[in-house]
């Protein structure tokens, strides 16, 4: 066992001479992003104060390619890198095409409305006049491709004029536009060469040891890894922690059960019920508030102040009133919970599916005519599953090196 341990320690660290270095640099696992949209069935009725009705559409599946660049080894046992992602639509795996039309809330209009609720009435009336002149409405009918990767919207210019410096978009707006052909920030992580216990743990993200999106030191901490590999020799007492730039926070998953993936022993880690709980149910999350109902996390502070919320799909594990407020939601543990299956000896993921939902808080705002009589509601926009499983040559090599060889050596 000590020989095996030495082999593992030698080969998991981030070092060009280690077996897993190329795997770390160019992840050989095929990743897929499956997106499900909530098509709004009754936009006119919602504007009259009726309950929203949605229909899930999808999946729209994209192959996700990741590669690390600007890899720089530092002299404090860390390595810095940028990871770029590109997405390629997969028609054969999708239920529909990128040219499918979806009716969804106009995030720019409804988001701006909620953001301006406490602004002077004059500004709100000017916005109403502008929205009317520009033909901006509370709901929009856009293609999947436009919603994902961006569409030209004059409102982007308007928001940049009236709220300078707040909006990360220029000319075009898309929910996944910032992810495609771009990096998720500069990660500096420990290599494990000098101290294996810190391997893969994030030292800094974009030069920061902690973020400032939230209202408590604990919530602002950058904990765990960058979300791709973890320290080796896990036990059922281990937790799986990582910093997610998209969620602007660290997340901690808990051990659920042992399993086997293609002959390789794994530990399954899942989200605890407290992941998106509000501060009154789980006090450590108080720093993520102001909160609405439990089970959704307000990400407005890191999403250009728009009233956007992150949760499990279909408001799984959230306060039931959220799913009850929208017709067409059916939370289901099997379909909507996330998991990561990790090989505990190496800390390398074998099979994973991270599922999250993005929702918009919308309501009628006095002075913004486009909001009509909308009753306050957290309306799901879409949910996605980012999934990957080790396969082919990589899986064969992994099985041989880390399952077969140790068995042979053991005998």
């Amino acid at each position: 066992p000590s020989l095996i341990k030495q082999q593992v320690l030698k080969n998991v660290r981030i070092d060009p001479s280690s077996l897993s270095f190329n795997m770390w640099k160019e992840i050989p696992i095929p990743f897929y992003l499956s997106v499900y949209f909530f098509d709004v069935m009754n936009p006119s009725e919602i504007l009259k104060g009726e309950k929203p009705q949605v229909r899930e559409r999808g999946p729209y599946v994209y192959r996700e390619f990741r590669h690390k660049s600007n890899i720089t080894f530092n002299n404090n046992d860390t390595v810095s890198f940028l990871e770029y992602r590109t997405f390629q639509f997969q028609p054969s795996k999708s239920h529909g095409s990128e040219s499918d039309y979806i009716v969804m809330p106009n995030i720019l209009v409804l988001g701006a409305a909620v953001m301006m609720e406490n602004k002077p009435m004059t500004l709100k009336l000017i916005m109403t006049l502008a929205f009317t002149t520009l033909g901006e409405r509370a709901f929009m009918n856009r293609t999947v491709g436009e919603i994902m990767w961006g569409y030209k919207d004059p409102l982007v210019n308007l928001i940049n004029k009236y709220f300078p410096g707040m909006f990360p978009f220029k000319d075009k707006f898309g929910l996944f536009a910032e992810l495609n052909n771009s990096d998720s920030g500069l990660f500096t992580v420990f290599t494990g060469v000098q101290n294996i216990s810190r391997i893969h743990l994030v030292d800094k993200w974009n030069g920061l040891s902690k973020v400032d999106f939230w209202h408590s030191d604990q919530c602002n901490m950058i904990n765990g890894t960058s979300g791709q590999m973890w320290p080796p020799f896990m036990t059922p007492e281990s937790s799986l922690e990582f910093y997610s730039p998209e969620a602007c926070r660290s997340m901690k998953l808990m051990y659920k059960e042992s399993g086997v993936f293609e002959g390789i022993p794994t530990y399954r880690f899942v989200a605890p019920k407290t992941l998106f709980a509000n501060g009154s149910i789980y006090p450590p999350n108080e720093g993520f508030c102001p909160c609405l109902e439990s089970g959704i996390q307000n990400v407005s502070t890191c999403r250009f102040s728009a009233p956007l919320f992150l949760s499990h799909p279909h408001f799984l594990n959230a306060d039931p009133v959220l799913a009850e407020a929208v017709t067409g939601l059916h939370p289901n543990q099997e379909a909507h919970s996330l998991f990561l299956d990790i090989h505990p000896v190496t800390g390398i993921p074998m099979n994973c599916s991270v599922k999250l939902q993005l929702s918009l808080y919308m309501k009628s705002v006095a002075g913004i005519g486009q909001t009509g009589k909308i009753e306050p509601v957290v309306l799901p926009l879409l949910w996605f599953a980012e999934s990957g499983a080790m396969e082919g040559e990589t899986l064969h090599t992994f099985y041989t090196q880390l399952v077969l060889m140790p068995k042979v050596m053991h005998y």
């Epitope: 009336l125 006049l129 009317t132 002149t133 033909g135 409405r137 009509g372």
Partner: antibody
Framework: EVQLVQSGAEVRKPGTAVKISCKVA????????IYWLQQAPGKGPEWMGL????????IYAEKFQGRVAITADTSTDTAYMELSSLKSEDTAVYYC????????????WGQGTLVTVSS | LPVLTQPPSASGAPGQRVTFSCSGS????????VNWYQQLPGAAPRLLMH???QRASGVPDRFSGSKSGTSASLAITGLQSEDEADYFC???????????FGGGTKLTVL
């Protein structure tokens, strides 16, 4: 479907004021913002101001600021536009308009009210 | 003077194609979408096109709109006698914090 019905033509002397009405029919008055526009002979329309009848909040174009007052009476489903200190250049057709919820641009207009300012 | 500039007149024979131009600046057409209104003689303006290239409800597909830089245009194909009217362009202007209109183009169907 919402319709806007305006009051009849008016003749005024310079320095006086005129008050035009715009009645909303066919739907709930307070669901619609009412916009007022001026169209001088042979020219394009010019936006003057707007009102949210729900809470009587208004804004006015800089050009008309101080001379125009837009009001609403929810008991009669009617919006009003009063223009004071009239000048001969104010001779024009005045329109109320709205945007039906979920539409774009000013897609519903009143028939217009001709105001002639002459000594 | 109107903020948006339109030629005062245009003409065409029935069945022909006519185009109206509307010139603005970076604070209006250059940054935002354009609406077009049709005003028949003695009537109120009627919304014809919104968000540059979208026809308003009930408008036939003979009408089309486009925009390039700080100019916009409206085209009518298969000209008909009932198209004889004034045509106004309009856009949001962020230096004036309001909508601005062109002076209008009078279309005569020959």
């Amino acid at each position: 479907e919402v319709q806007l019905v305006q009051s009849g033509a008016e003749v005024r002397k310079p320095g006086t004021a005129v008050k035009i009405s715009c009645k909303v029919a066919g739907d709930t008055f307070t669901d619609y913002f009412i916009y007022w526009l001026q169209q001088a002979p042979g020219k394009g329309p010019e936006w003057m101001g707007l009102i949210d009848p729900k809470d009587a909040q208004t804004i006015y174009a800089e050009k008309f600021q101080g001379r125009v007052a837009i009001t609403a009476d929810t008991s009669t489903d009617t919006a009003y536009m009063e223009l004071s200190s009239l000048k001969s250049e104010d001779t024009a057709v005045y329109y109320c308009a709205t945007d039906s919820v979920g539409s774009a641009g000013f897609d519903v207009w009143g028939q217009g009210t001709l105001v002639t300012v002459s000594s | 003077l109107p903020v948006l500039t339109q030629p005062p007149s245009a003409s065409g024979a029935p069945g022909q194609r006519v185009t109206f131009s509307c010139s603005g600046s970076g604070s209006n057409i250059g940054s935002y979408t354009v609406n077009w209104y049709q005003q028949l003689p003695g009537a109120a303006p009627r919304l014809l096109m919104h968000t540059t290239d979208q026809r308003a409800s009930g408008v036939p597909d003979r009408f089309s709109g486009s925009k390039s830089g700080t100019s916009a245009s409206l085209a009518i194909t298969g000209l008909q006698s009932e198209d004889e009217a004034d045509y106004f362009c309009a856009a949001w202007d962020d230096s004036l914090d309001g909508p601005v209109f062109g002076g209008g183009t009078k279309l005569t169907v020959l």
